[in-house]
């Protein structure tokens, strides 16, 4: 990351509170990162959200941590070991594997801040990378050389 | 989001600097969110990273903004309109569509903080949701009812 100039909150401002209060988000609602209500089975639907229409279908599992931003993350969990046939959407084709796609997401943890002489001075935000599984992808199996 | 207690940095601490300086990340290196060096073509490889072995292969496009955390984001771009055949890994199978999976990612923007009487008082972080394309997924086309 490049170096940013000093960011000193003005008196009375509370940086983490400011972060948390942000709520007006001009982005349209999207299918993923929200559990789907379709039956969780190893088949590719012809309607519904992307994760149920995929030939490597998956469900979402909630990971909630109130000391983290974002507090709610969703992990993908594959519903089939192999890919589902494009012909029928119901039976598996063992020529393809359903594999999880991982990503290191930037998250922020609330940690106690320690002032002079180790005294507790409120809370600070600590940036971390957090491994999440985003989706299941139909791949050709690796050929071992 | 739930309400967090007040987070006031102790004297001399710089919250956004603190966020930016975080670098020791105990997560193993992962394939995605990094451009792959395999040839960008509409075929499913039998080796290499997940995005090149997928039957809905994709490339990554860098989106860099020095006033944003994370500064570097990667957007997936599908290399094929349809899915690649599991049988050959090269021909397309028009029974499947290669579709982008979108996600609203939490990001933070550096914004000038304004103190009393509108004076400039350093920088604050502003939380936003930012739409990113994570991957391309092979799906059965929607059936129009």
């Amino acid at each position: 990351y490049s170096h940013w100039p000093s960011c000193c909150p003005s008196k009375g401002q509370d940086t983490s509170e400011e972060l948390l209060r942000w709520s007006t988000v001009p982005v349209p609602p999207l299918e993923p990162a929200r559990p789907n209500r379709h039956p969780e089975s190893c088949r590719a639907s012809e309607d519904g959200p992307l994760n149920s229409r995929a030939i490597s279908p998956w469900r979402y599992e909630l990971d909630r941590d109130l000391n983290r931003l974002p507090q709610d993350l969703y992990h993908a969990r594959c519903l089939c070991p192999h890919c589902v046939s494009l012909q029928t959407g119901s039976h598996m084709d063992p020529r393809g594997n359903s594999e999880l796609l991982y990503h290191n997401q930037t998250v922020f943890y609330r940690r106690p801040c320690h002032g002079e002489k180790g005294t507790h001075k409120g809370y600070c935000l600590e940036r971390r990378l957090y491994r999440v599984s985003l989706a299941c992808v139909c791949v050709r199996p690796r050929v071992m050389g | 989001y739930s309400h967090w207690p007040s987070c006031c940095p102790s004297k001399g601490q710089d919250t956004s600097e603190e966020l930016l300086r975080w670098s020791t990340v105990p997560v193993p290196p992962l394939e995605p969110a990094r451009p792959n060096r395999h040839p960008e073509s509409c075929r499913a490889s039998e080796d290499g990273p997940l995005n090149s072995r997928a039957i809905s292969p994709w490339r990554y496009e860098l989106d860099r903004d020095l006033n944003r955390l994370p500064q570097d984001l990667y957007h997936a771009r599908c290399l094929c309109p349809h899915c690649v055949s599991l049988q050959t890994g090269s021909h397309m199978d028009p029974r499947g569509n290669s579709e982008l999976l979108y996600h609203n990612q939490t990001v933070f923007y550096r914004r000038p903080c304004h103190g009393e009487k509108g004076t400039h008082k350093g920088y604050c972080l502003e939380r936003r949701l930012y739409r990113v394309s994570l991957a391309c997924v092979c799906v059965r086309p929607r059936v129009m009812g």
Partner: antibody
Framework: QVQLQESGPGLVKPSETLSLTCTVS????????WTWIRQPPGKGLEWIGN???????NYNPSLKSRVTISVDTSKSQVSLKLNSVTAADTAVYYC???????????????WGQGTTVTVSS | DIVMTQFPDSLAVSLGERATINCKSS????????????LAWYQQKPGQPPKLLIY???TREFGVPARFSGSGSGTDFTLTISSLQAEDVAVYYC?????????FGPGTKVDIK
């Protein structure tokens, strides 16, 4: 040589459930896909649905909410259930075995003789 | 769903003459990776179940006489009876098994002139 024989009641009352059985003899019920097709009097063929690997089903969207296909390997039988029948479900119902090729379902190579079902009160 | 159409609805051909039936699918049923057209032809005689004649658009089923042949690719297909015999009087159906729901054409009735 494999033979298929459909059986079930020839007359079903409206709003009731039509239940048919296809008994497979002279061959294994495993490793094949099984299909039900029907043919209303004087009309063409309509694909009802199929079952693959004894568990993976696909149904005609026009019948999906009313149809169930299942396999009982111990009895070498393929079953069809159609709920809430009306006069429009009057037809000859056929059971057929499909070739499987390269993890896909092929054409229907073996057919039963069919059984006539009339829906009437 | 893939819609199958057939033409003509019926035809009458003299014994020993060629009969040609056409079938058109509303979308391509060819998979290039295996170069196969997911199309079959069936013959149905009065009071009998259908019988498979041709699969993969051009492969003759075992035991089917050589006078029956299938051709075409993509969306347009043809069933040809090179020399019509009396026992060939029947209704002929094409069917796609490219993707579910599998669908049949409406049928073509073949008679002797």
């Amino acid at each position: 040589q494999v033979q298929l024989q459909e059986s079930g009641p020839g007359l079903v009352k409206p709003s009731e459930t039509l239940s048919l059985t296809c008994t497979v003899s002279g061959g294994s019920i495993n490793s094949y896909s099984w299909t039900w097709i029907r043919q209303p009097p004087g009309k063409g063929l309509e694909w009802i649905g199929n079952i693959y690997n004894s568990e993976n089903t696909n149904y005609n969207p026009s019948l999906k909410s009313r149809v169930t296909i299942s396999v009982d390997t111990s009895k070498s039988q393929v079953s069809l259930k159609l709920n809430s029948v009306t006069a429009a479900d009057t037809a000859v119902y056929y059971c057929a075995r499909t070739y499987n090729w390269n993890y896909e379902i092929g054409a229907m190579g073996v057919w039963g003789q069919g059984t006539t079902v009339t829906v009437s009160s | 769903d893939i819609v199958m159409t057939q033409f003509p609805d019926s035809l009458a051909v003299s014994l020993g003459e060629r009969a040609t039936i056409n079938c058109k699918s509303s979308q391509n049923v060819l998979i290039t990776s295996n170069n196969k057209n997911y199309l079959a032809w069936y013959q149905q005689k009065p009071g009998q179940p259908p019988k498979l004649l041709i699969y993969w658009a051009s492969t003759r089923e075992f035991g089917v006489p050589a006078r029956f042949s299938g051709s075409g690719s993509g969306t347009d297909f043809t069933l040809t009876i090179s020399s019509l015999q009396a026992e060939d009087v029947a209704v002929y159906y094409c069917q796609q098994y490219y993707s579910t729901p599998f669908t049949f054409g409406p049928g073509t009735k073949v008679d002797i002139k």
